[in-house]
């Protein structure tokens, strides 16, 4: 139903705390360089204005759209052009073009320093002094670094953060209580960020239909007892929610997500037997819980998929009558039978089925033509299964760091033109798939591995889009989202690449490396590894292992030496010489 004042409506629905959090996230995601204080001031002004509209919906400007209200606020910021360059040109446009312009200027890789966590005592002091400001800083810092972070989910992570601090700041040993818990939240939030970015990419590049197909497959796997109409309803609503968040309509998105959670909890009987635990929780926890609820038990009496989609004499008639519905029912039926497949694989199978019907239904004898379609799925299914087996075996053999290095070598060979920091970030993220997925039960590995890899490769594509350097990467990133991972997996050494000349300074290290945290040390070593591969793209695994072992030994020796600086300056050049010889 239409409301006189959209801003009053959303304020009333969401409540002041969530309203303010979402407005702060929205501003931080649009203007990523502004300080927390600048955004906090705007948020307060917007909130005060919303309250006047709640009191009187007919008050001046209360009837304006949220885009107009928020855009006007952003465009009133002083020195916009100096700080943001051409983004200021957006302010010369009218809505809805102005908002589209803001969206186009979101930066997936802003030049902001890494978000450093203060030490425990300092954190607890500032948290106790002003919990609201502390959490506001958290929302601001995460949102500006992740401009597509799913806003209602970021509120959930902030709530988690709050609970951890409340608990740990009361303990004697704050550090050992906080560190593992906050690391856990950070890891989950980072995965949530790349997954949501993938959803927004799907929406932006291929439209709502593509996202809805993803949602149908995912929901059918999770709720195999819900009927097709129910799954389609949920997918339609979920598509709306995600479209709003990806489009910067964060208040509408959070409000509609709460509505969807409410609907699911009121209709558990027709959706799933596994929802009750989630539905007993408060709003943010409930919606988060529903988004990762365990799969319901599959119905025992499901007929073979072939009955309706291959053997039925009316396949072509049914397809012609309503293509989207027929393909939707195929995707639904196949997905509910295969919780052990990745969504990407299910969408590839549905695409194959559609292509087969398009071809066969135009022929003289369609059943003879599409009769073998299910057998033709086999290679499509085997390929990711082999990928999972090979990679999980390698992960179990090498451990996470070694597995990351193996991936780093592989991907540097595939796309040596890509910048070393991007390759290292990608390999570290891709390598985490082992820890995340390879320890799971067999039937959960494939969906975990492939859907996670797809999300990470989407980030690779986004970063590469800004500065395209590799034809290999451009080729894989230009196709459909579901074909990206197989495309990257199939890439081999780039034969067109002219190796980088050997520069001694790239492999020169100083004693400051010794005091770095383990993660930073690893990144330094992995940076050197990528540079080695760029110098010798066809170096064997043995050669690279020899060099890296030597490098690790050198660091170990010099970091234990009494005079570290002398050790680094004398042993460093020897290491460089040995490296060159080993790779010659």
């Amino acid at each position: 139903e239409a409301h006189k004042s959209e801003i009053a409506h959303r304020y009333n629905d969401l409540g002041e705390q969530h309203f303010k959090g979402l407005v702060l996230i929205a501003f931080s995601q649009y203007l990523q360089k502004c300080s927390y204080d600048e955004h906090a001031k705007l948020v307060q002004e917007v909130t005060d204005f919303a309250k006047t509209c709640v009191a009187d919906e007919s008050a001046a400007n209360c009837d304006k759209s949220l885009h107009t209200l928020f855009g006007d606020k952003l465009c009133a910021i002083p020195n916009l052009r100096e700080n943001y360059g051409e983004l200021a040109d957006c302010c010369t446009k009218q809505e809805p073009e102005r908002n589209e312009c803001f969206l186009q200027h979101k930066d997936d890789n802003p030049s902001l320093p890494p978000f450093e966590r203060p030490e425990a005592e300092a954190m607890c002091t500032s948290f106790k002094e002003n919990p609201t400001t502390f959490m506001g800083h958290y929302l601001h810092e995460v949102a500006r670094r992740h401009p597509y972070f799913y806003a209602p989910e970021l509120l959930y992570y902030a709530e988690q953060y709050n609970e951890i601090l409340t608990q740990c700041c009361a303990e004697a040993d704050k550090e050992s209580c906080l560190t593992p818990k906050l690391d856990g939240v950070k890891e989950k939030a980072l995965v949530s960020s790349v997954r949501q970015r993938m959803k927004c990419s799907s929406m932006q590049k291929f439209g709502e239909r593509a996202f809805k197909a993803w949602a149908v497959a995912r929901l059918s796997q999770t709720f195999p007892n819900a009927d097709f109409a129910e799954i389609t309803k949920l997918a339609t609503d979920l598509t709306k929610v995600n479209k709003e968040c990806c489009h910067g309509d964060l208040l509408e998105c959070a409000d509609d997500r709460a509505e969807l959670a409410k609907y699911m909890c009121e209709n558990q009987a027709t959706i799933s037997s596994k929802l009750q635990t989630c539905c007993d929780k408060p709003l943010l926890k409930k919606a988060h819980c529903l988004s990762e609820v365990e799969h319901d038990t599959m119905p025992a009496d499901l007929p073979a998929i072939a009955a309706d989609f291959v053997e039925d004499q009316e396949v072509c008639k049914n397809y012609a009558e309503a293509k989207d519905v027929f393909l939707g029912t195929f995707l639904y039926e196949y997905s509910r039978r295969h919780p052990d497949y990745s969504v990407s694989l299910l969408l590839r199978l549905a695409k194959k089925y559609e292509a087969t019907l398009e071809k066969c239904c135009a022929e003289a004898n369609p059943p003879a033509c599409y009769g073998t379609v299910l057998a033709e799925f086999q290679p499509l299914v085997e390929e990711p299964k082999n990928l999972v087996k090979t990679n999980c075996d390698l992960y179990e053999k090498l451990g996470e760091y070694g597995f990351q290095n193996a991936i780093l070598v592989r991907y540097t060979q595939k796309a040596p033109q890509v910048s070393t920091p991007t390759l290292v970030e990608a390999a570290r993220n891709l390598g985490r798939v082992g820890t995340k997925c390879c320890t799971l039960p067999e039937d959960q590995r494939l969906p975990c591995v492939e859907d996670y890899l797809s999300a990470i490769l989407n980030r690779v594509c986004l970063l590469h889009e800004k500065t395209p350097v590799s034809e290999h990467v451009t080729k894989c990133c230009s196709g459909s989202l579901v074909e990206r991972r197989p495309c990257f997996s199939a890439l081999t050494v780039d034969e067109t690449y002219v190796p980088k000349e050997f520069k001694a300074e790239t492999f020169t290290f100083h004693s400051d490396i010794c005091t770095l945290p383990e993660k930073e040390k690893q990144i330094k070593k992995q940076t050197a590894l990528a540079e080695l591969v760029k110098h010798k793209p066809k170096a064997t695994a043995e050669q690279l292992k020899t060099v890296m072992d030597d490098f690790a030994q050198f660091l170990d020796t010099c970091c234990k030496a009494a005079d570290k600086d002398t050790c680094f300056s004398t042993e460093g050049p020897n290491l460089v010489t040995r490296c060159k010889d080993a790779l010659a």
Epitope: F228, A229, E230, T232
Partner: nanobody, 117 residues
Amino acid sequence: EVQLLESGGGLVQPGGSLRLSCAASGFTFNHYTMGWVRQAPGKGLEWVSLIHPSGTVIYYADSVKGRFTISRDNSKNTLYLQMNSLRAEDTAVYYCAKWSSRAFDYWGQGTLVTVSS
């Protein structure tokens, strides 16, 4: 027994509008997805739209998107189809139908819509 009774059809000029209604009885209307299907003279069936019990629209045929709007009033056990910007190719018998799990299981008698100048 399940009964579906369509009304609202008739002759309309191109660019004009019509609103079809379907009165349902004999089943718990607000538990079922409902839809409209049409059959043009000498042609096969074409699905037009589907609506979930909650009122969420879950399907429009590409040929009617942006022109037709499906809706329902569960308190009145009635399904509607608002048809705007009608074209000659929309001429057909329009059937109201009840969806059950994976297909339509009950149909009305149909109402004829003729778009002609």
